[in-house]
Amino acid sequence: AQYTRPSNVSNIDVSTNTTAATLSWQNFDDASPTYSYCLLIEKAGNSSNATQVVTDIGITDATVTELIPGSSYTVEIFAQVGDGIKSLEPGRKSFCTDPASMASFDCEVVPKEPALVLKWTCPPGANAGFELEVSSGAWNNATHLESCSSENGTEYRTEVTYLNFSTSYNISITTVSCGKMAAPTRNTCTTGITDPPPPDGSPNITSVSHNSVKVKFSGFEASHGPIKAYAVILTTGEAGHPSADVLKYTYEDFKKGASDTYVTYLIRTEEKGRSQSLSEVLKYEIDVGNESTTLGYYNGKLEPLGSYRACVAGFTNITFHPQNKGLIDGAESYVSFSRYSDAVSLPQDVAAAHHHHHH
């Protein structure tokens, strides 16, 4: 049979997902119901590996599968009739498959830094990069991330900095390729903690008796993490700035003369049965010298006529020595210190003085 050459196809339409493209087209020849169509699908930059699809007669659509996500392709469509008589020119169309979403990403806190490290494996296929969105309440930040390669299963990471401590962030990462955006992948991550900010003031110390004092102080600000505990520290020495080293000294050490500074009382804030908001500042009042014991610290009687100063340590993380039961490990804890109070001088023991006078 004799056939005239088919006209070229036109109006090629493409709809895509990550790994397939559905193509449809038109041919306006009266004889088009007798045509089949030959499709050549070529990945950009890889002409040696074209996929060929031939449709059944009269079919003007086809779905091509096993494509690579986020990749650019060109399709050429020839109309053909009889024994391979083809249209002179193919209809041509470039298209991109949709990029693949990131399967998931993990968050890691950065110790003592208001930052998060995000880790992920590259999604399959090609990408031009990623959109990163970080949001917490009214604050948000959008940035671009560089592209990655899925070929070797490498773990990719980025550090998100300039965040707040102990704050929950909504994080979204969107794959981009060929000007297309995948569905965002979301996670909620919370930043870590660090030493609390040292308070501006110092505790208030007042004499109650010849062997006890009252120490009053305000709770530390919780912007670097919730305050887990406070330690009340006394000294009879020079009131320099205390260091974490003093947290190992007890009343017993003080009595033995091993140290002029010691921890006399420990408050675990969780035990107060209420959560402290960032703005809520609690007031504390401690009786020092009442012979109570908190963990490894004995709150022993003070020396009559002694001169004492008080300081408070606040902890966002309190760690105890595994071997010295109940004693704080200052190096492993997240702690900051108030300044020392002014000195208070205890009165003499009136009863003892009276007794001494009679003899």
Partner: antibody, heavy 117, light 107 residues
Framework: EVKLVESGGGLVQPGRSLKLSCAAS????????MAWVRQAPTKGLEWVAY????????YYRDSVKGRFTISRDNAKSTLYLQMDSLRSEDAATYYC??????????WGQGTLVTVSS | DIQMTQTPHSLSASLGETVSIECLAS??????LAWYQQKPGKSPQLLIS???PLHDGVPSRFSGSGSGTQFSLKIRNMQPEDEGVYYC?????????FGAGTKLELK
């Protein structure tokens, strides 16, 4: 095929309000960062506002901050720009656009906003 | 704000000629640079994003190069349909900013 169609432009007096819409089709609207870009008559292009896909975070150029509000309705595949306290310098053709990785990829045909008393 | 300085302001080229448009960013923008073509009465069209990848359907006679602060758009084999105004734009940092445009005419 990506299609963006802006509407809502018109003549408005200074100090008054106008709300622009952009109807999107041919792509998964909820996946995309979207933006408004404007072009004053015979002038260049100026980015106006931007909204993300994940949490709908918004960003504005300083001159419109506090007066313009970008929003999106993913169920309707529509982007909006609420423009309040309009000034003569806001007169322009307003385009909506998809904006992956900081590039304005697909554009609508634009809607003209005229601000005059 | 990052300033985008485009040169030249206008140029005319003969059919088949190669033309170059330069764009200078006032600070480093990595490769977050796009080029657009706008014809009278029409919307801008993306030509190139990320400094060099051609957008879908853009003829291969267009090419982009550069990174950091200096970028250029090259049009080889000038065609009548290439007439229009060309804009560069940085998408690195808010506010996203455009160059003032380069008007390209056919001689």
């Amino acid at each position: 095929e990506v299609k963006l169609v802006e509407s809502g432009g018109g003549l408005v007096q200074p100090g008054r309000s106008l709300k622009l819409s952009c109807a999107a089709s041919g792509f998964t609207f909820s996946n995309y960062y979207m933006a408004w870009v404007r072009q004053a008559p015979t002038k260049g292009l100026e980015w106006v506002a931007y909204i993300t896909n994940g949490f709908g975070s918004t960003y504005y150029r300083d001159s419109v901050k506090g007066r313009f509000t970008i929003s999106r309705d993913n169920a309707k595949s529509t982007l909006y720009l609420q423009m309040d306290s309009l000034r003569s310098e806001d007169a322009a053709t307003y385009y909506c656009s998809t904006v992956p990785l900081g590039a304005f990829v697909s554009w609508g045909q634009g809607t003209l906003v005229t601000v005059s008393s | 704000d990052i300033q985008m300085t485009q040169t030249p302001h206008s140029l005319s080229a003969s059919l088949g000629e190669t033309v170059s448009i330069e764009c200078l960013a006032s600070e480093g923008i990595s490769n977050y640079l796009a080029w657009y073509q706008q014809k009278p009465g029409k919307s801008p069209q993306l030509l190139i994003s990320h400094a060099n990848p051609l957008h879908d359907g853009v003829p291969s006679r267009f090419s982009g190069s550069g990174s950091g602060t200096q970028f250029s758009l090259k049009i080889r084999n000038m065609q009548p349909e290439d007439e229009g105004v060309y804009y560069c734009q940085q998408g690195y940092k808010f506010p996203y900013t455009f160059g003032a445009g380069t008007k390209l005419e056919l001689k």
